[in-house]
């Protein structure tokens, strides 16, 4: 018998070594996902790791390369898409990022059934984007601001529109203030579901003011960055919907859909649209003044070929406690009927919940219910709805999947995701195959995260996808932190809290504590999510305390937190941290003479407004491209939560909320103020405008700025930055380089 | 391995009808999708028919209602019923996977539509 002495485990327990920031910078710790590039009920393409094109087929466990990697190397691609008859891939190469989702590529079609590139007639360069239709393979792409359509892939282009100009005209594609704040794509051009019709929205920009910025590059004279920027109050784009029919595409041209009356009376939005046959669309269209919301149901007419959306097929919805629907409006999903819908909205209780709507809104049947909310519908088919929500055990930062029996009454509820790897898996989300066949399930955390998949009807796992056995393994020797997910209950508010603490934790002892917050409205930070980050690493090495805390203003727990900043915005958000920050103070283990605040974006604007309240809490602060007025920010964004910054609406409380006002009481702490010069989301002009009110309250601060970098401070940025941020937190904290 | 072997083709009039058969020697999975193209001499090959192990199917825009891919899972055979034939369906037809794997070409069968 051989005993091992104890002292091996201590040795064992010495390679264990805390993360280090070059673990983070060099994204030593990442995770992969898998989702499944669906092709049908039972198969799905995925690019391997040594970048073949492979089709997965899972009722006969094959698989089989359709494009190798010599060929998508042959062009540099690192992107494809297979067109639906799987004729023809298109290969993309030359990304060139433009926004948070535009970008420019060149693309290629390579031929399946031929085994070459399709030469004749090709793609002019660059592209802004580019798909197939849902059924063949016809081509629709937007190049210079117009719409061109390709029957074929060899065939000469139709051009649709012709009035597209640079920074004027938008066909097919968003303006800057419709892709960060409405679409979220880079797209704005909807097939019909068999290809039969194209929608396209042309933005008009024509009146909308700029904002020129430099950008410095490396010539004698720097470049002017010009963007139509409409900012809060400012004049909006135009937007018109249009519809053409692509098998004869000159017949009649594209016909204009109506925007119902109610919201053509005064500025307007569209904020959506979705196909529900190839002869029926539904239209969302947005007041302005972002309460109301008009859902209009259209119909193809044969005689005049022009499209018809009678008063019938208009529903509104409407808020009278805030903006209408959560951060953005949400989209219906159709049933099999192409009249009845099912979407998320408020209940009469003020929980965003999923309705089945069949004739109007008021009639509407409510599917879930309770003091939780319904978050997305993923799919509805002939017999089951699956959605997810955070209703399970009451913690808002979960996300699990749900099916609903919608075939049999009653409607009966499952949770496909509750038990499956409990500990590890708390936040999911999923991806369906064509009739909800089969589904992939990808957990976030908050354990490592892990991609499996699962059989539509009876939901059991086939196989995993993806489980990070490489990032298991290599977090075997790593002290990570300790994660706890707590809420705290002050005045009838439920403040929920993650704190992230040191590995040898003890609450005998005094740590530095670092609050990161974000904030912004409809947002959330607590969530069950796996991690390792910069904060991670401060926890694990530096021996922080981090906390994140969702206060009034955040999403997923009722419309009351969610609407509570409305008009209002950097006044409750800031208290609610500063009262969490008191409650952990009073837990004892939280040294209240090294509290620091961190955030970007609008966590930047938080953090500020924070440093700024006088409370004396904060001995440090950092502040990442903060908003700084909401007079400069973009109008879709401020207005939602804002309203106009008019005498006769809300300017009051714009000149109230600016950090600029607060210039004084930043006297008492140590600030980092930090923006790259090329932001074209939160401008430079925001940081500027602090810097300034300082130097003129002769008050002392710290600046980084990064130039020629956007609002994501991406590249060599990140790294400069995040060692820059750590020096400074090390020496608030009087912690040994 | 599998090979797949077309059959069925030949000579017939306008407005005619044809059968056409492919049998995978090997085994092959009624889950498999599978297609049938065609190619004229000089021109690129093309895509008639497709149809998924879910039998779903996709049909080229000229095929306009004439033709039907269909399967037999008992028999490992895949059939495309070509109806209302016209001379510019004259070409070789094959059947391969869908998409197509360039290994699997077979020797197709010749279809000839002239009166």
């Known amino acids: 018998i051989v005993l091992r002495p104890s002292r091996v485990h201590n040795s064992e327990e010495n390679t264990m070594r805390a993360l280090t920031l070059k673990d983070i910078l060099n994204g030593t710790f990442s995770y992969k996902t898998f989702f499944p590039n669906w092709i049908s009920g039972q198969e799905y393409l995925h690019q391997s790791a040594d970048n073949n094109i492979v089709l997965y087929n899972i009722e006969t466990g094959q698989s089989y390369t359709i494009l190798s990697n010599r060929t998508m190397k042959s062009v540099n691609a690192s992107n494809y898409g297979l067109s639906p008859d799987r004729q023809f891939v298109y290969l993309e190469s030359d990304y060139s990022k433009l926004w948070r989702y535009s970008y420019t590529a060149t693309y290629y079609i390579y031929d399946l059934s031929n085994g070459e590139f399709v030469r004749g007639n090709e793609l002019p360069r660059p592209i802004q984007y580019l798909c197939w239709s849902p059924v063949g393979s016809k081509l629709a792409y937007v190049y210079q601001n117009n719409i061109y359509l390709k029957q074929r892939p060899g065939d000469p282009p139709f051009q649709i529109t012709f009035n597209g100009r640079e920074n004027k005209i938008f066909n097919g594609i968003p303006d800057w203030v419709y892709e960060e704040e409405m679409l979220a794509t880079k797209y704005a051009l909807w097939w019909s579901p068999n290809g039969k019709f194209l929608a396209y929205a042309e933005f008009n920009d024509t009146d909308i003011p700029v904002i020129a910025y430099s950008y410095y590059g490396d010539e004698q004279y720097p470049r002017t960055i010009n963007i139509p920027y409409p900012k809060a109050g400012a004049k909006n784009p135009v937007v018109r919907i249009f519809i053409i029919d692509t098998t004869y595409p000159a017949y009649v041209g594209p016909q204009e859909v109506p925007v119902p009356a109610m919201i053509a009376s005064s500025d307007y939005y569209f904020s959506w649209l979705t196909w529900v046959t190839d002869e029926r669309v539904c239209l969302q269209w947005l007041k302005r003044v972002q309460n109301v919301s008009v859902l209009s149901i259209c119909d193809f007419r044969e005689d005049w070929q022009t499209w018809d959306c009678p008063k019938t097929q208009e529903h509104i919805e409407e808020s009278r406690t805030g903006w209408a629907g959560g951060f953005f409006v949400s989209t219906p999903v159709f049933s099999y009927d192409a009249i009845s819908y099912y979407k998320i909205f408020s209940d009469k209780d003020g929980y965003k919940h999923i309705h089945y709507i069949k004739d109007t809104v008021e009639n509407a049947i409510q599917i879930t219910s309770g003091k939780w909310e319904a978050i997305n519908i993923f799919r509805v088919t002939q017999d089951s709805l699956f959605y997810s929500s955070n209703e399970f055990e009451e913690y808002p930062g979960r996300r699990n999947i749900y099916r609903i029996s919608i075939g049999s009454y009653p409607p009966s509820k499952k949770c496909v995701t509750c038990h499956l790897r409990k500990e590890r898996c708390q936040y999911y989300t999923a991806s369906f195959s064509d009739y909800a066949k089969y589904y992939a399930l990808v957990c976030y955390g908050p354990g490592i995260p892990i991609s499996t998949l699962h059989d539509g009807r009876t939901d059991q796992e086939i196989k995993i996808l993806e489980e990070n056995k490489e990032l298991e393994n290599a977090l075997k020797n790593i002290q990570l932190p300790k994660e706890e997910i707590k809420k705290l209950e002050v005045d009838e508010i439920t403040l929920w809290y993650k704190m992230i603490l040191p590995p040898q934790f003890d609450r005998s002892k005094k740590y530095p504590l670092l609050i990161q917050v974000y904030g912004g409205p409809c947002s959330q930070s607590v969530r069950s999510v796996f991690a390792v980050n910069w904060i991670s690493y401060l926890a694990s090495k530096e021996g922080m305390v981090i906390a994140l805390v969702d206060g009034r203003g955040t999403a997923f727990q009722g419309d009351k937190l969610l609407y509570a900043v409305y008009r209002k915005l950097g006044v409750y958000e800031v208290e609610d941290q500063i009262t969490a920050v008191r409650k952990f103070i009073e837990m004892g283990f939280i040294d209240e003479k090294r509290i620091a605040i961190w955030g970007w974006s609008y966590g930047g604007y938080v953090s500020s407004l924070a440093l700024a309240s006088g409370t004396g809490l904060f001995k440090c602060g950092i502040a990442v491209a903060p908003v700084s007025s909401w007079e400069y920010y973009a109008s879709v964004y401020t207005e939602r939560f804002m309203g106009l910054p008019t005498k006769d609406d809300n300017l009051e409380h714009y000149k109230n909320s600016t950090v600029m006002a607060r210039a004084e009481y930043f006297r008492n702490v140590d600030y980092l103020l930090i923006h790259g010069t090329a932001d074209d989301n939160v401008h430079f002009q925001n940081s500027a405008q602090i810097a300034k009110a300082l130097v003129n309250a002769q008050v002392d601060f710290q600046a980084m700025w990064y130039s020629d970098q956007n609002h994501g401070l991406s590249g060599l940025s990140t790294n400069h930055l995040y060692t820059h941020m750590t020096h400074f937190l090390k020496q608030c904290f009087s912690l040994s380089d | 391995d599998v090979q797949l072997v077309e059959s069925g083709g030949g000579l017939v009039q306008p407005g005619g009808s044809l059968r056409l058969s492919c049998v995978a020697s090997?085994?092959?999975?009624?889950?498999?999708?599978m297609a049938w193209y065609r190619q004229v001499p000089g021109k690129r090959r093309e895509l008639v028919a497709g149809?998924?192990?879910?039998?779903?199917?996709n049909y080229a825009d000229f095929v306009g209602g004439r033709f039907t891919i269909s399967r037999d899972n008992a028999k490992n055979g895949l059939y495309l019923q070509l109806n209302g034939l016209k001379p510019e369906d004259t070409a070789a037809y094959y059947c391969?996977?869908?998409?197509?794997?360039?290994?699997?070409w077979g020797q197709g069968t010749q279809v000839t539509v002239s009166s």
């Open positions: 149809i998924t192990g879910g039998g779903e199917t």
């Open positions: 090997g085994r092959l999975s009624s889950s498999n999708s």
């Open positions: 391969n996977f869908w998409p197509p794997l360039i290994n699997y």
